[in-house]
Amino acid sequence: GGTAEKEEEIKPDQPFSGPLPGSLPADHRPFFAPHSSGDQLSPSQTGRSHPAHTATPQMTSAASNLLPPVAFKNTIGRIVLSEHKSVKFNCSINIPNVYQETAGISWWKDGKELLGAHHSITQFYPDEEGVSIIALFSITSVQRSDNGSYICKMKVNDREVVSDPIYVEVQGLPYFTKQPESVNVTRNTAFNLTCQAVGPPEPVNIFWVQNSSRVNENPERSPSVLTVAGLTETAVFSCEAHNDKGLTVSKGVQINIKVIPSPPTEVHILNSTAHSILVSWVPGFDGYSPLQNCSIQVKEADQLSNGSVMVFNTSASPHLYEVQQLQALANYSVTVSCRNEIGWSAVSPWILASTTEGAPAVAPLNITVFLNESSNNLEIRWTKPPIKRQDGELVGYRISHVWESAGTSKELSEEVSQNGSWAQVPVQMHNATCTVRIAVITKGGIGPFSEPVDVAIPEHSRVDYAPSSTPAPGNTESM
């Protein structure tokens, strides 16, 4: 059988035709034994016979050597056709009657048996000398996956007979195995794009297209690497793969020029304390380059514009930062900027943030403690310390008194309203020591406790010593 190098020279779309093998008598009608669903196909011209894998009869008589070996007749060899066309081909074999045991013909492609939904059919033409068998195979709409080497196999007297291969080449438009990928590049910096496509038919030639215009006037054989010297603005690239069937165009990929990010938006203060603010923001467009870090700038809003700016750097994610070490009850202006590999974004619009009142920094002064035996109370007095505006509005005082006697200890506290400067505390135990400390409470929180003042509480008898006290700062007089 000849091979057809020229496209579709074999005429695979034609029906099977030609004389039946073995010069069968006209009155012998074929028997059909389909392998699977398929059209009934008429037998094909099979060409000249020559042995492929052959079988000889298993006989002991000397006559067995005179019998011809069994072999498939020569196949068509090679079929070249276009995608989506139909193709039909066959194998044929003559089995003399001396061969008692034969199995059906099976079709194999690239070493694997074809089972199931393939359109194959077997025709039997018996006569006095034996039987001619034709195995017919058809594919209604060929695809690239049908490319390959097809063979017939048959078992004759436990020997496997194999036909010559039928090579099917399905030709179509080029098929991309590698398409260009979108990249983000630095302005005026070289970069590469890659494109690869295959046939058949080969060769496949590549043209590059930038913004709908060809880059190269002469094609490059696939695969092709396009080196772009540099871009100053966004461009769309694609590649065209050309072969003798036509051309296929890859997806268009956008090549973006990296720029500085856009400024962050939606800067908010999520939470404020006396000395910190929690800042959140939404990152702006990243400029086609990942954000690396962000900068939060804070300045006192009440000062003139030349006031010093505090800068706090943080990672780009999460989009949240707690600015600490701020003054209480103060107003600040806040802005955020982020950077990528190209540079820093412009700053976001400044927003106002305020810290809350702080806890007072001073303790009450001039604390005195006096035991009133008649009422069995401790009388405690103090003077209000100087409280700054940022310490917050005075709410009251907290009095801590700890009682200790013979290994037992009891800690109690009282709160008194802002107007008071004295308090009475019931005696909790006798023959004990009471330690008193007082702290200022403002809306900003509780301040530090004063230095402790100790009072000795005797058995139920008169107190014969002066009251305990803490002097005001700078005052060394005993009370």
Epitope: N205, E217, N218, D244, L247, V249
Partner: antibody, heavy 122, light 107 residues
Framework: EVQLVESGGGLVQPKGSLKLSCAAS????????MHWVRQAPGEGLEWVAR??????????NYADSVKDRFTISRDDSQSMLYLQMNNLQTEDTAIYYC?????????????WGQGTSVTVSS | DIQMTQTTSSLSASLGDRVTISCRAS??????LNWYQQKLDGTVKLLIY???RLHSGVPSRFSGSGSGTDYSLTISNLEQEDIATYFC?????????FGGGTKLEIK
Amino acid sequence: EVQLVESGGGLVQPKGSLKLSCAASGFTFNVYDMHWVRQAPGEGLEWVARIRSKSSNYATNYADSVKDRFTISRDDSQSMLYLQMNNLQTEDTAIYYCVRDGSHYYYALDYWGQGTSVTVSS
Amino acid sequence: DIQMTQTTSSLSASLGDRVTISCRASQDINNYLNWYQQKLDGTVKLLIYYSSRLHSGVPSRFSGSGSGTDYSLTISNLEQEDIATYFCQQGKMFPWTFGGGTKLEIK
């Protein structure tokens, strides 16, 4: 100046054969792909066949309507293009143009002959 | 196969007019669209290739545009010698196919 001159047209009976020729001059014939295009009376243009240059192994393409009946060939030494037409049918009646492919992979037919008339009739 | 459609089969215009002839492909042909002029004597000439490139020797009053599936040929200032039939053709894949033609006549 590019010149393409067709010949070989005429009257032929259905199922008959005819061979068209095209003599090319004024350009380097062997580097160009060549085509045949036809136009039936009162109809539009119909591409028929292409043959590529030697560098592309003389690969051929055909319209489905003529596949297996027509064969395109060339003789670079003589700067000749041929179209062998077998099993002609009445619908093959047309003016047949020999055409040069503009190349550079733009797939445009840049120079056309004046055409030769083929009539298939009994 | 790719179908090429020229919806207007004939067109009347006056000398000096701006004339546009359109052509539509049944699928994206990626600018592989060519325009031809056929005179009454049967002579065929290439005018525009690759959608918008002017073939050598063609007057600049001819221009082509389009992309994807829709293309057009424009004659900016119609002259007597432009009276002809105009065909579009796709070269993206075989078989190459032509539009049905648009016959341009003088009013």
